[in-house]
């Protein structure tokens, strides 16, 4: 089942997968001035069994300029955009990482490819997400987001961080109320209707550092 | 290889300190988060502590006040500053390292050092 | 704070025979992570997010689930199995496991 929307966008962060569920779509998308080649694959696809996980279809781009009398294969522009892309940074991945049962690992790049990939994400993927240099991370909890199927919908959870300048010395946006998001909150079981679990966090300045600690006063 | 180490762990008094060290390597600190979890014997896992990648910290409401987190990226090591110790704080004190950045799942773990808080 | 309540908290079974460990949140959740331990030695990572399996965890086990019950299954118990299972949650904070079933040969 493919995840209806984007993972949630956080200002001044950017997310990334550090593998791909089976199922997941990768656009062959190339950078300005080439397009795919003539009977191309339109995407990649993570297909696997029940040993080893893989990307099905190669990406191959060729430059506009050479001529064919063949008509070629364009992505139009909502094929475009109907992903936003999970890799602002390096598409390579890290070399810790463990690979997964029934995951792909990030694919490797091809020649000429856009400088964004669009993945098209299936329920149960987890992004990551990590600020962009000059911000630095302020956690209620854990900087991730799942896409999951709720009453069959589906939705990404919300990713538990907050970007901030490195000059703003401001508290820990959790004195406040939390604002009611309809992403990330634990949902009723006897409806649909988004509710959220208030807590109170408290916080503390230390040198370059904000500490948040969860009290237990619950609603 | 992803590897993480603990030590410190010891016996101690009553109201006595200790601090525990996480050496960690195969990735730096500066990309993952850190957390703490312990055990008491016979008992269940027990989140303590959790340092993220840049810096911030949470705790357990519980001990919060006498437990402090600390790492040094330079050394890629992980600290648990355990201050007032009672005999409640016996466990085995694992750190443990989500499988994606600031995550939540606990994809690698330490061996675990054994605190003891006895007179 | 959400509480999770694993059931039953031993269950005798012979290798073979399937195993359905339960783990409810007393408030509703996004996603559960499970781990396995055994004496001595620390949690083992066997699922996160539900339903994916961690690194090398055979496919046996599986995981489902929403809101606030889950389910961790194994389709055929291996001698190696016989251990304590861990739920997992951090939807909401702070973090918290479960207390544990514990797996025992009949």
């Known amino acids: 089942e493919l995840c209806d929307d984007d993972p949630p966008e956080i200002p001044h962060a950017t997310f990334k997968a550090m593998a791909y569920k089976e199922g997941t779509m990768l656009n062959c998308e190339c950078k300005r001035g080439f397009r795919r080649i003539k009977s191309g694959s339109l995407y990649m696809l993570c297909t696997g069994n029940s040993s080893h996980s893989s990307w099905d279809n190669q990406c191959q781009c060729t430059s506009s300029a050479t001529r064919n009398t063949t008509k070629q294969v364009t992505p139009q522009p909502e094929e475009q955009k109907e992903r936003k892309t999970t890799e602002m940074q390096s598409p390579m991945q890290p070399v810790d990482q463990a690979s997964l049962p029934g995951h792909c690992r990030e694919p490797p790049p091809w020649e000429n490819e856009a400088t964004e990939r669009i993945y098209h994400f299936v329920v149960g993927q987890m992004v990551y997400y990590q600020c962009v240099q000059g911000y630095r991370a302020l956690h209620r909890g854990p900087a991730e987001s799942v896409c999951k199927m709720t009453h069959g919908k589906t939705r990404w959870t919300q990713p538990q961080l907050i970007c901030t300048g490195e000059m703003e010395t401001s508290q820990f946006p959790g004195e406040e109320k939390p604002q009611a998001s309809p992403e990330g909150r634990p949902e009723s079981e006897t409806s649909c209707l988004v509710t959220t679990t208030d807590f109170q966090i408290q916080t503390e300045m230390a040198a370059t550092m904000e500490t948040s600690i969860f009290t237990t006063e619950y609603q | 290889q992803v590897q993480l180490v603990e030590s410190g762990g010891g016996v101690v008094q009553p109201g006595g300190s200790l601090r525990l060290s996480c050496a960690v390597s195969g990735f730096s600190l500066t990309s993952y988060g850190i957390q703490w979890v312990r055990q008491a014997p016979g008992k269940g896992l027990e989140w303590v502590s959790v340092?993220?990648?840049?810096?911030?910290?949470n705790y357990n409401s519980a001990l919060m006040s006498r437990f402090t987190i600390s790492k040094d990226n330079s050394k890629s090591t992980l600290y648990l500053q355990m201050n007032s110790l009672r005999a409640e704080d016996t466990a085995v004190y694992y750190c443990?390292?989500?499988?994606?950045?600031?995550?939540?799942?606990?994809?690698?773990w330490g061996q675990g050092t054994l605190v003891t808080v006895s007179s | 704070e959400i509480v999770l309540t694993q059931s039953p908290a031993t269950l005798s079974l012979s290798p073979g025979e399937r195993a359905t460990l339960s783990c409810r949140a007393s408030s509703s959740v996004s996603y559960m992570h499970w781990y396995q331990q055994k004496p001595g030695q620390a949690p083992r990572p066997l699922i996160f997010a539900t339903s994916n399996l961690a690194s090398g965890i055979p496919a046996r086990f599986s995981g489902s689930g929403s809101g606030t019950d889950f389910t961790l299954t194994i389709s055929s118990l291996e001698p190696e199995d016989f251990a304590v299972y861990y739920c997992q949650q951090w939807s909401s904070n702070p973090p918290t496991f479960g207390g544990g079933t514990k797996l025992e040969i009949k």
């Open positions: 340092i993220w990648a840049g810096g911030s910290t």
């Open positions: 443990a390292r989500a499988y994606g950045y600031d995550g939540s799942w606990l994809a690698y």
